[in-house]
Every structure is written in C-alpha cells, then in structure tokens.
C-alpha cells in the first residue's frame, strides 16, 4: 500500500530571465527512493538516479542545474517556460509518486511564490 505523500512548491511564479528552484519532497513512507524524474509535459528535463547521479536532458543542458538535493534549478527563464512541471519519484517497494508544480514566468518584477500544497 502506498502511504507516502509528495509536498511540492505548488504554484510559483518567477521573472523572465531569472531562475527558479523546483522542489518536491516525499514523506510519510519508508520506501527507498531509487530515482527522481523531472518532466515538463512529455519532455524530460532531468533524472536523479540514486546509484548513477544526475542526467540532464541534452535539450535543457545549458539552462538546467541539478539540485539542491533532489530538486532542479531552471535558469534563464522565458515566457515559454510557463506551464506544468512534474517530479516523479520511483520508489521501492511502493512504486511511483508524482508531484505537480505550476510555474508562471512573468514579464514584470511582480513574481511571487504561491502556497505549498500536498498531493496524496
């Protein structure tokens, strides 16, 4: 039975040209995290494998940095980066947990962080 929950940074906004940290945290489970995949739509941004380290997709290599932790730093933001981002936690023995973050990239400097929320 999957007992874990993923806490994410929720709905966030950031300024065009700036950077943002995408962060998820898995709690309420003793399952072992074997891998975390970061995706935008059907595009892979990066994978953090517990044994092998980080793989950044070639499409994002110039503006995605691993970390902090299992999170991901997205740099040189453009308006086209607005949208849904997913952290997919591969765990043993539970299986897969998915968290969602919505990022809005703003033209002006009125970017504010949204509230944190949980996905069961």
């Amino acid at each position: 039975m999957m007992t874990g929950t993923i806490e994410t940074t929720g709905n966030i906004s950031a300024e065009k040209g700036g950077s943002i940290i995408l962060q998820c945290h898995l709690s309420s489970t003793t399952a072992q995290v074997t891998q975390v995949n970061w995706e935008q739509q059907d595009q892979l941004l990066a994978i953090c494998n517990a044994d092998l380290g980080w793989h950044i997709s070639p499409s994002f290599k110039d503006r995605v940095a691993p970390g902090p932790g299992l999170g991901l730093t997205l740099q040189s933001l453009t308006v086209n980066d607005t949208g849904e981002y997913f952290c997919i936690y591969h765990t043993y023995p539970d299986g897969t947990y998915t968290g969602r973050i919505f990022l809005e990239v703003l033209e002006s400097s009125v970017a504010e962080h949204g509230a944190r929320f949980q996905i069961p």
């Epitope: 074997t34 891998q35 995949n37 995706e39 059907d42 595009q43 892979l44 994978i47 494998n49 044994d51 092998l52 380290g53 980080w54 793989h55 950044i56 997709s57 070639p58 499409s59 591969h90 897969t96």
Partner: antibody, heavy 120, light 106 residues
C-alpha cells in the same frame, strides 16, 4: 579507444553457476557504469544489471535472486555470476559501458558478445 | 516493467529510399529512448539517445517522438544499413528493449 571483451565458458550445465568476465581496456572503470545485457536465440535484448563507478549494483528484478555483478578495479574488469541456470539462460551475453551524465541509460560501448549454452 | 513494442517486425526498402521504424511504450517514457543498430554477428551500436540526439559519428539516422510513440528514420537507405534495429527505454529500471525491426534491401 575503449574496448570491452567478454570471456567465460561457452557451455554450462543446468543448475550450475554461469560466470563471465568483461575486461575493459583504454578507460578506467572508476567512472561511468558497467552493464550486462543478454540476448537469447531469436529473442529481444534483456537487461541484466549494472555496477556503478562507486561499486553500487542494480539487478533486473526478474533475475535478482540469481545474479551477482562485481568488479576488480585493479584489473579493470567486472564480472557476472548467474546461479541455478536452466536452458532459458542460453544466450549471447554482452557487457557494455554507459555514461549516465551525458547519455542517461543509453549504452554506447559494447563488447562483441559471448555465447553461453546451458546443456547437460 | 515498461514494455516496448516495435513495428513492423521487418521492412524491405529500396536503396536510397526512406525507412521508418516505430516504437511504442506501454506507458509514457518522456524522451528517455535510445535506438541501436545490430548487424548480423555483431553487437548493438548506439545510434540515437534522448529520443532525437544522434550519437557521435552517426549519419542518415534521425529519431523523433515523446511520451509513448517514437520513430527512427533512415533518410536514404544504404547497403550497410541492413541490420536489426532496437529501441530501448531508460525512463525507469529495469531498462527494456523492443523486439527489433529487421531492415532489408528491396
């Protein structure tokens, strides 16, 4: 140029242990990760597992109870042991190198393969 | 495990013509797809990684797709392209391969 060379007995009796070695030349095994893959006659490639640059191992759950992958960095080689073999383990066995940072799970240097037949 | 299904099983194409091979994943695998070429009696060789990136020194071949559906295209078939082609996912462990597509000259 990196070269991988599999070696080991071509014939193994049922219920015995299959032992193969992959000798790596032209590159140090202290980085990247090192894989075993097999191909039964007329069937698709099957992933067996890996040993990482740090010595951590992953085994395909379908074979996990029977598989051990180890390494000897002083000899720049890694090994596969598969216990309690049956005719279904008859296959061409390949070793291969991966660079997770750049290529993820794509394996880009392969040995020529060694044929192992399980028969009494 | 993620099941990779290739189509067609075999393909006969005239020299200089385009060859297209399809690969479908049983669940979404984003862009974590590699393609390999295996000539008779040889080991597999990496052609494409991350669904669409050509490995060093690979000509004529291109890859596309994301999610569950992927394509390998040989733009102009040459005699040396006769081989079996395999897709592989590395979205999650264990890595899994398609059943292969045999490409021949018509």
């Amino acid at each position: 140029e990196v070269q991988l060379q599999e070696s080991g007995p071509g014939l193994v009796k049922p219920s015995e242990t299959l032992s193969l070695t992959c000798a790596v030349s032209g590159y140090s095994m202290t980085s990247d990760y090192w894989n075993w893959i097999r191909q039964p006659p007329g069937k698709k490639l099957e992933y067996i597992g890996y040993i990482s640059y740090s010595g951590r191992t992953y085994y395909n759950p379908s074979l996990k109870s029977r598989v051990t992958i180890s390494r000897d960095t002083s000899k720049n080689q890694f090994s596969l042991k598969l216990s309690s073999v049956t005719a279904a383990d008859t296959a061409v066995y390949y070793c291969a190198r991966g660079d997770y940072s750049n290529y993820g799970g794509a394996m880009y240097d392969w040995g020529q393969g060694t044929t192992v037949t399980v028969s009494s | 495990d993620i099941v990779m299904t290739q189509s067609p099983d075999s393909l006969a194409v005239s020299l200089g013509e385009r060859a297209t091979i399809n690969c479908r994943a049983s669940q979404g695998v984003s862009t974590t797809i590699a393609w390999y070429q295996q000539k008779p009696g040889q080991s597999p060789k990496l052609l494409i990684y991350s669904a669409s990136y050509r490995y060093t020194g690979v000509p004529r071949f291109s890859g596309s797709g994301s999610g569950t559906d992927f394509t390998l295209t040989i733009s102009s078939l040459q005699a040396e392209d006769v081989a079996v082609y395999y897709c592989q996912q590395y979205y999650s462990s264990p890595f899994t391969f398609g059943g292969g597509t045999k490409v021949e000259i018509k």
